[in-house]
């Protein structure tokens, strides 16, 4: 069998459009594909952040590809040409790789970058990120946050910083239209008169960092002599009922503690006639049907039912938060 040598694509490069980690990989067709004019060649593209164990592999007929990367690390990529099986008349094909790398030249020592970056998407409505200044940075250091997601023309800077001692330590984001279920990119860079400050890059999806409001309107209903139904309502806001999981804490007569996780806004509790007091609190979290992760809400106000006979439905609402 003869062997065909096929060149790799030309001008293979990684281009940074300024989207804080969303990069373009692009190339041109290989030289001298004259023998294969009738064939639709494909390209096998492999890429990863440097230090990652696995390559991501794409096969495409296009001359470009886009994906997100962690710009705190370098990126390596390689590409070669593939010929369709039917094109080669049984000949073996040797296809060499073109390789390229990309990284942002780091400024400043790692300790100068922001510490303990924490972002929460409150009630699927308000994004707030906070951080601590880098270790050993002077008071003249200030940090700036930039963000981008698909749908924005360019990266935007935070316009509502949270400050402490004149330094930016957080950002309150504006309304973010059509921003969930896609990668959300953040860069926090800094400036100082005295020394360069290392930039930090973060990527997450907003639906995975939601902290809902606590459930409301907690009530009791006697179902039978030995069953009480606990009910509550979803909090106000954009999160639909199908997206919630709940955790309940129930105390009977200040001793028995029952905890349960449920998917609906009700829980049926077995009780005895001796029960004198019943209190419960509920908290909510976005479930696996709507996100890959989430943050538990605060506990609801405590709702208690007291009296000689629970069936009299004597309700006492305690307006302090349970911790």
């Amino acid at each position: 069998d003869t062997e065909i040598k096929v060149n790799p694509p030309q001008d293979f490069e990684i281009v940074d459009p300024g989207y804080l980690g969303y990069l373009y990989l692009q190339w041109q067709p290989p030289l001298s594909l004259d023998h294969f004019k009738e064939c639709t060649v494909e390209y096998e593209l492999k890429y990863r952040n440097i230090g990652s164990e696995t390559w991501k592999t794409i096969i495409t007929k296009n001359l470009h590809y886009k994906d997100g990367f962690d710009l705190n690390k370098g990126i390596e990529a390689k590409i070669h040409t593939l010929l369709p099986w039917q094109c080669t008349n049984g000949s073996e094909v040797q296809s060499s790789w073109a390789e390229t790398t990309y990284w942002i030249s780091p400024q400043g020592i790692p300790e100068t970058k922001v510490q303990d970056m924490d972002c929460v998407y409150y009630n699927w409505q308000y994004l707030l990120c906070s951080w601590k200044p880098g270790i050993g940075v002077l008071l003249d250091t200030n940090y700036n946050l930039f963000y981008w997601y698909e749908g924005l023309d360019h990266a935007l800077q935070c316009v509502d910083y949270i400050k402490a001692d004149g330094q930016n330590i957080g950002c309150r984001f504006p309304y973010l239209e059509a921003s969930d279920y896609k990668d959300f990119y953040i860069c926090v860079n800094g400036s100082s008169e005295n020394k360069p400050i290392r930039s930090s890059y973060f990527t997450f999806q907003l639906q995975n960092i939601v902290k809902p409001l606590p459930p409301v309107y907690l009530t009791f209903t006697r179902e039978s002599s030995c069953e009480i139904k606990l009910k509550w309502s979803i909090p106000l806001g954009p999160i639909p009922a199908r997206c919630f999981d709940y955790e309940i804490e129930i105390r009977e007569d200040d001793t028995t503690l029952v905890t349960a996780t449920v998917e609906n806004e009700t829980y049926t509790l077995k009780t005895t006639n001796e029960t004198r007091q019943l209190c419960f609190v509920v908290r909510s979290k976005v479930n696996i049907y709507c996100s890959d992760d989430g943050i538990w809400s605060e506990w609801s106000d405590k709702q208690c039912w007291e009296g000689e006979d629970l069936s009299k439905k004597t309700l006492l609402r305690h307006h302090h938060h349970h911790h």
């Epitope: 010929l83 099986w85 094109c87 080669t88 094909v93």
Partner: nanobody
Framework: QVQLQESGGGSVQPGGSLRLSCAAS????????MEWFRQGPGEQRELVAH???????EYADFVKGRFTISRANAKNTLYLQMNGLKPEDTALYYC?????????WGQGTQVTVSS
Amino acid sequence: QVQLQESGGGSVQPGGSLRLSCAASGINISSDVMEWFRQGPGEQRELVAHITTNSRTEYADFVKGRFTISRANAKNTLYLQMNGLKPEDTALYYCALRRGGRILWGQGTQVTVSS
């Protein structure tokens, strides 16, 4: 005629399982690298899993621990066991046979994960 034929796709609820098969004809697959790719709407084909001639396997990060690739050389067939399926696994799944710089594709089988 050399060809690959996938089967086993279908519709399943989140958390469900499917087993895809890829039968080769006109070629003996025992000495070839075999792979599963998938292609979502408007996306490029991305590698899901890869198996060498001596059955060493590699998986994309997004399926590790959920999918298992295997091969039965005597039956000239490649398999993909898919457990813990998620809505984002919805795609057309293709098997591919690799030999150097040439590639043979199957026609694909549709997997839909929806509640």
